[in-house]
């Protein structure tokens, strides 16, 4: 575009150099050339000469009119045809932009990943604006009334050191550009309620060589949170359907979960946890693949007849991915054997 151009005249845009996409736009060119009474004034857009909708207003001024201008950016300049000059003479140029006012930011979420030292807030920005849009995150203490403001694009990390004076905050996001300003809904945040436990990791799995073989999955976390509620989901690699188990965990020692699985099959396991009674889940852990051993004795295997852990508080449900193309969208099977619940908030689903 044109950042610094020596104009021999003026160029201006109505309604302005930044305008709403789809508007009708008039661009004016006024020459102030010495020793030139121009025969013609020409307009160029992105270096290409324009042919239509040009009006000569008077000796020095011309206008070009665009109906429903919808390009996000254009570089306009105008020239004069001076008698006795072989080349056209540059008069002036302008960068113009079209776009949209911002949508109100939605789905504002703030979490503290354990040990991170930051509160991370994310939101949906809505439809593209095509023009420079700034997001200001407001964090207001409900105890001291003091407000902090952070510039961001689609997320912000706020040091918990700057959140020492209070536990309760009001958080909202303001979207601002040349065409408008919108605020998100306000989010009430209690710092103690938004901590996500340190990542849970499946470290290994083994299948015993018993008459009825069982698979033991070992998993751990470095969390210091005492009361943690977890889900483990698993399926064969050839299956679309996940089984999900729930249990309370105490990470002062490595967790062991027992499964009775089909022999000679490749299984995928993933785990995620949350602080008991809180709403924010960890993302699913990295997929852990385990091959069960071959069947030793004769046994009629009925899928889903016995995949449970020897803990009375456990529930097992089945969820299925909609398709291999949409592995992150999960839905309940229409009929499940067990009391179930959807595996929501899946960030690392695999088909």
């Amino acid at each position: 575009g044109i950042t610094s151009i020596n104009c021999s005249g003026d160029m201006w845009v109505e309604p302005g150099e930044i305008f709403q996409m789809g508007m009708n736009v008039s661009i004016y060119c006024q020459e102030a050339l010495k020793h030139c009474r121009p025969r013609n004034l020409y307009f160029y857009k992105n270096g290409f000469k324009e042919e239509f909708d040009i009006t000569r207003i008077n000796r020095t001024t011309a206008r070009i009119w665009y109906k429903g201008f919808s390009e996000p950016h254009a570089y306009m300049h105008c020239t004069a045809e001076c008698p006795g000059h072989f080349q056209e003479t540059l008069i002036c140029g302008k960068d113009i932009s079209s776009g949209h006012p911002p949508d109100a930011p939605s789905n504002l979420t703030c979490v503290i990943y354990e040990y991170s030292g930051n509160m991370t807030c994310t939101w949906n920005t809505g439809k593209p604006t095509y023009i420079d849009t700034k997001y200001i995150v407001h964090v207001k203490s409900l105890e001291t009334e003091e407000e902090q403001q952070y510039l961001a694009s689609s997320y912000v990390k706020i040091s918990t050191d700057s959140l020492q004076g209070s536990r309760k905050y009001l958080v909202w996001v303001q979207a601002v550009n040349s065409l408008g300003m919108e605020n998100s809904q306000q989010l009430h945040v209690h710092l103690d309620d938004i901590v996500i436990p340190s990542a849970s990791i499946i470290s290994r799995a083994e299948t015993t060589n018993d008459t009825v073989p069982k698979t033991i999955v070992y998993w751990k976390s470095k969390t210091m949170i005492e009361k943690v509620f977890c889900e483990m989901r698993y399926k064969t690699t050839t299956n679309q359907t996940w089984s999900v188990k729930e249990f309370d965990a105490n990470f002062t020692y490595v967790q062991q979960s027992e499964f009775y699985l089909e022999p000679d099959s490749k299984y995928v396991f993933q785990v995620r946890c949350q602080e008991t009674g809180k709403r924010n889940w960890q993302p699913w852990s990295s997929p852990f693949v385990h091959q069960t051993s071959q069947e030793t004795g004769k046994r009629n295997w009925q899928p889903w007849s016995s995949p449970f852990v020897h803990q009375t508080s456990q529930t097992v449900s089945q969820v299925t991915a909609k398709s291999s193309h949409e592995p992150q969208k999960m839905e309940m099977l229409s009929a499940t054997i067990f009391r179930g619940h959807p595996a929501s908030g899946n960030h690392q689903d695999i088909g």
Epitope: I136, H138, V139, E146, Q148, Y150, S159, S162, Q174, M181
Partner: nanobody
Framework: QVQLQESGGGLVQPGGSLRLSCAAS????????MTWVRQAPGKGLDWVSG???????VYADSVKGRFTISKDNAKNTLYLQMNSLKTEDTAVYYC????????????RGQGTQVTVSS
Amino acid sequence: QVQLQESGGGLVQPGGSLRLSCAASGFTFSTSAMTWVRQAPGKGLDWVSGIDSGGTTVYADSVKGRFTISKDNAKNTLYLQMNSLKTEDTAVYYCATGLPWGNIWRTRGQGTQVTVSS
């Protein structure tokens, strides 16, 4: 209560430099977003530069590359280093709490005059 006091203005030739200071008190300066705004003769208030609560800075196109905003939290002081000054930078400069958008400049100081002239 919030108090802001600007200083460092003066008369300078085009191409020269000035450093403005803003002494702050009555609030938690270290975690507050701050802005420099200016008012040219016969014109409205325009924002110049802002610094957010985490130290991210933003500048108006007209001063980008010439002005630098900074904070010294130990001294509760906001600065604006102005280089390559132009005649069009002539204005009264104010420091204010908050960023340049929204409920803007809810509190600002008395201002300091900057005149760029040959």
